[in-house]
Interface confidence: low
């Protein structure tokens, strides 16, 4: 840019003119330096002096300017006869994250100095949270009433939600920023005409056992009176680690009769007190007709009559399944709702959220807990997350 000024009138960059000395003169010189993580590439020393032709000259390299190159501490590979070195990098993800890309994560430097992948061009991969791979999975040999202490952190997707009246319930982490819970949990101590906007600020949510996370919004299922489900969006993504990890959403329905799932929870224990420690229980999926008869007397709509042994009727429909008490009289209880019925797919070595506990009033009195089928709500979950 031609400033219209003589070059020797150095730009006013806030640098005071040095004082003159007798029988001497001031020589203008500059030193080139590089930003963090870059280093100077030059055969000179980076110091350039203004000559009488108003050119910046370095003693060793003349008017050839230095360059800043990435200082990654990576030595230059040796050259080979009749060959050349091709620069390539492989993207990898930190622990508990995996690469999401249609390519292989390897990028090569092209002639235009762009990093290019054969399959996806210059589109970079992303690191997404691993789901359903706890570092210390629950041991099926051990035997949330009764139940076992989750001493090893086997249920890193389990969150604890506390209402503004200090009632504890469950929620289930399904990705870095979203959790599933029940609509009933969200409405605890709220009137039926409360809105999602009213509800969000009244909830406190903990992940990783005791780490508080802030809620941005809640989204209720459009048919929440029949499908007892809501989603919670966090203000920030959580860092996934061995204590905090989402559970995977299933691509198939694991809720077949007899299949055993694990349900963890912060709900009431055998003394009917809220537990200070996360507990878990192993429960089998029950026959749906038996469950309906247990709670409603009949599977025939016109013959149904409220029969719940605990005085509260669960929602039972095509979006739900039941799980029975264990043979040890272990069961879910108040405060466990919102927790996942987690099934371990042994072939994939992955844990899937097959259901979300909706009816947690069984407490070893009624025979069945009732769960919302995750396969029934999966389209809505994915659509909601995409839109928000």
């Amino acid at each position: 840019v031609d400033s219209g000024n003589d070059v020797t009138d150095i730009a006013d960059d806030g640098c005071p003119k040095p004082p003159e000395i007798a029988h001497g003169y001031v020589e203008h010189s500059v030193r080139y330096q590089c930003k963090n993580y870059y280093k100077l590439r030059t055969e000179g020393d980076g110091v350039y002096t203004l000559n009488d032709k108003k050119q910046w000259i370095n003693k060793a390299v003349g008017d050839k300017l230095p360059e800043c190159e990435a200082d990654d501490g990576c030595p230059k590979p040796p050259e080979i006869a009749h060959g050349y070195v091709e620069h390539s990098v492989r993207y990898q993800c930190k622990n508990y994250y995996k690469l999401r890309t249609e390519g292989d994560g390897v990028y090569t430097l092209n002639n235009e100095k762009q990093w290019i992948n054969k399959a996806v061009g210059d589109k970079l991969p992303e690191c997404e949270a691993v789901c359903g791979k706890p570092k210390n999975p629950a041991n099926p040999v051990q035997r949330i009433l009764g139940g076992h202490l989750d001493a090893k952190g086997s249920f890193p997707w389990q969150a604890k939600m506390v209402s503004h009246h200090n009632l504890t319930t469950g929620a289930t982490l399904i990705n870095e920023q979203w959790l599933l819970t029940t609509a009933k949990n969200l409405f605890l101590n709220h009137s039926e005409n409360a809105t999602a906007k009213d509800i969000a600020p009244t909830l406190t949510l903990y992940v990783g056992k005791k780490q508080l996370v802030e809620i941005e919004k809640v989204v209720l299922h459009p048919n929440y009176s029949q499908v007892d489900i809501g989603l919670i969006k966090l203000k920030q993504k959580v860092s996934v680690n061995e204590r905090v990890m989402p559970i995977c959403l299933p691509s198939k329905d694991y809720a077949e009769v007899g299949r055993v799932g694990y349900v963890s929870g912060w709900g009431r224990n055998a003394n009917f007190k809220f537990t200070d420690h996360l507990k878990y229980v192993m429960l089998p999926v029950a026959d749906q007709d038996q469950c309906i008869r247990h709670y409603e007397g009949s599977t025939v709509p016109e013959k149904k009559t409220p029969k719940s042994p605990v005085g509260v009727q669960p929602i039972l429909n095509e979006h739900t399944f039941c799980a029975g008490m264990s043979k040890y009289q272990e069961d879910t209880c108040y405060g466990d709702a919102g927790s996942a019925f987690a099934v371990h797919d042994l072939e994939e070595d992955t844990w899937y959220a097959t259901g979300i506990l909706s009816f947690d009033k069984s407490c070893a009195v009624a025979e069945y807990g009732v769960y919302v089928k995750v396969t029934s709500i999966q389209d809505w979950v994915q659509k909601t997350i995409a839109e928000n």
């Epitope: 600020p201 005791k210 996370v213 959580v238 860092s239 680690n241």
Partner: antibody
Amino acid sequence: EVHLLESGGGLVQPGGSLRLSCQASGFTFNSNAMSWVRRAPGKGLEWISSIGANTNYIYTADSVKGRFTISRDNSKNTLYLQMNSLRAEDTAAYYCAKNRDRYSYDAWSVWGQGTTVTVSS
Amino acid sequence: DIQMTQSPSTLSASVGDRVTITCRASQSIDIWLAWYQQKPGKAPKLLIYEASSLESEVPSRFSGSGSGTEFTLTISSLQPDDFATYYCQAYNSNYPYAFGQGTNLEIK
């Protein structure tokens, strides 16, 4: 560059009030929980108060509860600490701090240089 | 409230030494522990979070370990820049944030 700059410290008499400010820059202020921490002469670090990105979440140490109030103005990227009924034992360097990562309550990775409060008659 | 007890209060060591500072919590805090370094007249600097995770740009000679109630900070080979005061901090949200009383690491 992430930067926090405290101001508002000074000399105040016992029973007096001061309001500290912390100007934040270089990050999304309204998505981060913020805290005040102090260090009294010859003593260790002491947590004072924290406020979430969502201001429903406020926590204050028992030693200052009822006297100190934390607040924030997200439109001005500024954190405040209103200090009333000051005592000699409140004399300290006061730091504001930003949480490290995405958790609302986390270790603090960015600190201001501090502002000094002296309570003396 | 939770109490954090750091030891020793003062530690004399030489450049190149391996030093260990310990921190004990009065109740389990899982992995929610941080270590900070503070030099006179300066703000504290985060070294370790989640008990053992190294904060970015902190030299790898610093390491942390432990969970529950017992934690340690280790400096594998002391450098002149490492002489400072070190604090542990519990930041589990169920308690007030509690600091240890500090360990002054000085030149022998």
